[in-house]
């Protein structure tokens, strides 16, 4: 708490301007009217206040708006937003996309903080839905935000937003999320040529179906093992040894080190040992020569 002291003569602020930049904490508290501050919040961001001074300004706004700031003030918080706590933000009702953008811009360069997460949550709740404009804005500032959404929420993500996604932003996505994102990425990158397309689509391939993997195997893409290990098991199982060899190119030798891990383990169990032997990697566990493979799932479907 800043102690209450009278404002020195001639120091009373008539407007929020740079004359305040070297005011001491107690002078700001005593000489700046909270209502004046609220109406001129847009000026604060242009003035080089220290964090200590920003704390005083925040305290004045908190006193003026104990139930939470109005959106007219929130939109112009600028760097003062960095001083807000999640508890402060939970009191807000943010409905304007412009307000959201203004605050995300302030936080640009920072990781997604609890404050930003709370702001986004308040915004989405205030709007009642995750519309395309909102998602476009959020993925532009935080591409990693995609992985925090449910598959249902992801279904409304516009393919154009996919362009902003970096590979590391998908690290926390689970297969259900990638199942939704992959078709969007495929659509977003459809006009790129083979090698460029593969570079862009690579991090989304955890959602790719078998037929797309087969198609990629015909394009000399040389998929690395890390990407292969993230593919859907059900999409990998129908691939032939020749297709996997073409898909991985020179990286095919890495299968040996991964033979006990999914999806490689399960894929090996589905291949004829004769075919596996053609790779010359010493992969074991394939179907012995002379054995007949019955697809029981097919048999059940027919009956």
């Amino acid at each position: 708490e800043v102690e209450k002291t009278a404002c020195p003569s001639g120091k009373k602020a008539r407007e929020i301007d740079e004359s305040l930049i070297f005011y001491k904490k107690w002078e700001l508290e005593a000489c700046v009217d909270a209502a004046l501050l609220a109406t001129q919040m847009d000026r604060v961001n242009a003035i080089p206040f220290t964090y200590e001074q920003l704390d005083v300004l925040k305290h004045k706004l908190d006193e003026l708006y104990p139930q939470g700031y109005p959106e007219s003030v929130i939109q112009h918080l600028g760097y003062l937003f960095l001083k807000m706590s999640p508890e402060d933000i939970r009191k807000w009702n943010v409905t304007s996309l412009e307000t959201l953008k203004a605050l995300l811009e302030v936080n640009k360069g920072h990781e997604m903080s609890p404050q930003v997460a709370t702001l986004i949550d308040r915004f989405v709740k205030g709007r009642g839905q995750l519309d395309k404009d909102t998602l476009d804005t959020l993925t532009a500032f935080y591409p990693g935000y995609l992985c925090s959404l449910s598959p249902e929420e992801l279904s409304s993500v516009p393919p154009s937003s996919i362009w902003a996604v970096r590979p590391q932003d998908l690290d926390t996505c689970d297969p259900r999320q990638l199942d939704v994102l992959y078709p969007k990425a495929r659509l977003a990158f459809q006009n790129m040529n083979g090698s460029e397309y593969f570079v862009k689509i690579q991090s989304f391939l955890g959602g790719a179906p078998t037929e797309d993997l087969k198609a990629l195997s015909q394009q000399n893409v040389s998929m690395d093992l890390a990407t292969f290990m993230k593919l859907r098991t059900d999409a990998v199982l129908p691939l032939t040894v020749a297709e996997v060899q073409k898909l991985l190119g020179p990286h095919v030798e890495g299968l040996k080190a991964e033979e006990r891990h999914r999806p490689v383990r399960d894929w090996i169990l589905r291949q004829r040992q004769d075919d596996l032997d053609t790779l010359g990697l010493g992969l074991q566990g394939g179907i012995p020569n002379g054995y007949l493979v019955l697809d029981l799932s097919m048999q059940e479907a027919l009956s």
Epitope: E18, L20, I21, N45, P48, Y51, E52, H110
Partner: antibody
């Protein structure tokens, strides 16, 4: 090109005076608060003084208060530091610096090359 | 506010992970910047607001911390990174700098 260029440094006797200048170019000078930061030979950085964009507000470190005066002429895009009653411990390279990014901040992304002030008899 | 940097100097090799710490005498929230300075040159801003990377600065530089304890990390030291590093607080006046950490070639 956005740049700051200091001048006016040199050798001065203890008790003497010197006026440093910092010529700014490539940006709207009057919109930015400016600072002087110094560095004694082989030592660290010390924030000496600052001035608001209009020149109406100033700040001085205790070590120079009453001896140094910061000012600016926005029509000439120039920052000044008038140094009086100089002491041996004022020997340093003097840099002018500011923050050019969006919004007012008190860290510095634009620096001049510095000018050396040597106080010695 | 006093800023204490440690170590004051260190020797490292290209490719090493280097960590420099800056401790404030009182809490300064995230009001901390980091600079790199090479001999005869002006300081260069690397990090602001404790963890935000200045535009154009390589991603091998990162900052962390809040309150009183802060860290600058260089994930894989490059030949051009041998220099002196300073922290600076802008929580309150007067603005103050740490004493510096000189990173030398081992």
């Amino acid at each position: 090109e956005v740049q700051l260029l200091e001048s006016g440094g040199g050798l001065v006797q203890p008790g003497g005076s010197l006026r440093l200048s910092c010529a700014a170019s490539g940006f709207t000078f009057s919109s930015y608060a400016m600072s002087w930061v110094r560095q004694a030979p082989g030592k660290g950085l010390e924030w000496v003084s600052a001035i608001s964009g209009s020149g109406g507000s100033t700040y001085y470190a205790d070590s120079v208060k009453g001896r140094f005066t910061i000012s600016r002429d926005n029509s000439k895009n120039t920052l000044y530091l008038q140094m009086n009653s100089l002491r041996a411990e004022d020997t340093a390279v003097y840099y002018c610096a500011t923050w050019m990014g969006g919004g007012g901040r008190w860290y510095f992304d634009l620096w001049g090359r510095g000018t050396l002030v040597t106080v010695s008899s | 506010i006093q800023l204490t940097q440690s170590p004051s100097s260190l020797s490292a090799s290209v490719g090493d992970r280097v960590t420099i710490t800056c401790r404030a005498s009182q809490g300064i929230s995230s009001a901390l910047a980091w600079y790199q300075q090479k001999p005869g040159k002006a300081p260069k801003l690397l990090i602001y607001d404790a963890s935000s990377l200045e535009s154009g600065v390589p991603s091998r530089f990162s900052g962390s911390g809040s309150g009183t304890d802060f860290t600058l990390t260089i994930s894989s030291l490059q030949p051009e990174d041998f220099a002196t590093y300073y922290c600076q607080q802008f929580n309150n006046y007067p603005l103050t700098f740490g004493g510096g950490t000189k990173v030398e070639i081992k």
